[in-house]
Amino acid sequence: DAEFRHDSGYEVHHQKLVFFAEDVGSNKGAIIGLMVGGVVIA
């Protein structure tokens, strides 16, 4: 028997990925980070 139509059984949550670079001074280089859902993860 064919399956009846239903949505996938899980929900996809869309989150904004924000890359940023922050200058912390001439002799300290820069911090490059990745923020996912408001939390810096890299």
Epitope: D1, A2, E3, F4, H6, D7, S8, G9, Y10
Partner: antibody, heavy 123, light 112 residues
Framework: QVTLKESGPALVKPTQTLTLTCTFS??????????VGWIRQPPGKALEWLAH???????SYNPSLKSRLTISKDTSKNQVVLTMTNMDPVDTATYYC???????????????WGQGTTVTVSS | DVVMTQSPLSLPVTPGEPASISCRSS???????????LEWYLQKPGQSPQLLIY???NRFSGVPDRFSGSGSGTDFTLKISRVEAEDVGVYYC?????????FGQGTKLEIK
């Protein structure tokens, strides 16, 4: 509030084509995930699923009746139409339409039903 | 087709007592999306069917909490913890996982 109402002839002759209309309010068939189906119940017997149509015009039929059934929709009129060809006395039943909506935040079950319309097939 | 078999077909119950209806499917009704689309409907005398339980164990809005559904695979149960007079009618299990969608034969609950 959500309502559905079936309409059509009370009596049809054998070999004729039955046309039933489900007119609904309180929701729209242009809404993503929305669908309307047909179910019938012969006198004193169990329920039998016939067909279903979705907002995107995808359709599903009971294979045992597929050659006789056509389901269609008129979104602007808030109507779903079921036609059944070559009617026979065994098709005498109460015919119901019911709403079913896909979606993770939806019930995904037949949550609202019409009152039913009784069709007798006799010469 | 998936055959849905209910038992008992007739169920006389004394008000205040519990009641249980069994529904067995001839094959698994687990959908590929991980959900089991097993539903219970009640058809009160002279009325249209009404939804009680969806996806095995979820009560529809407005359904009293004395109704509960359980099961998995091919074995499902509807329980009424304390039957009331207004619960009389025919109870149908229904699977919406595979085409054709199919109902059980119905269980007629009556008050003793």
């Amino acid at each position: 509030q959500v309502t559905l109402k079936e309409s059509g002839p009370a009596l049809v002759k054998p070999t004729q084509t039955l046309t039933l209309t489900c007119t609904f309010s309180g929701f729209s068939l242009s809404t993503s995930g929305m669908g309307v189906g047909w179910i019938r119940q012969p006198p004193g017997k169990a329920l039998e699923w016939l067909a279903h149509i979705w907002w995107d015009d995808d359709k599903s039929y009971n294979p045992s009746l597929k050659s006789r059934l056509t389901i269609s929709k008129d979104t602007s009129k808030n109507q779903v139409v079921l036609t059944m060809t070559n009617m026979d006395p065994v098709d005498t039943a109460t015919y119901y339409c019911a709403r079913r909506q896909l979606g993770l935040r939806s019930i995904d079950a037949m949550d609202y039903w019409g009152q039913g319309t009784t069709v007798t097939v006799s010469s | 087709d998936v055959v849905m078999t209910q038992s008992p077909l007739s169920l006389p119950v004394t008000p205040g007592e519990p009641a249980s209806i069994s529904c067995r499917s001839s094959q698994s009704i687990l959908h590929s999306n991980g959900n089991t689309y097993l539903e219970w409907y009640l058809q009160k005398p002279g009325q249209s069917p009404q939804l009680l339980i969806y996806k095995v164990s979820n009560r529809f809005s407005g359904v009293p909490d004395r109704f509960s559904g359980s099961g998995s695979g091919t074995d499902f149960t509807l329980k009424i913890s304390r039957v009331e007079a207004e619960d009389v009618g025919v109870y149908y299990c229904f699977q919406a996982s595979r085409v054709p969608l199919t109902f059980g034969q119905g269980t007629k609950l009556e008050i003793k």
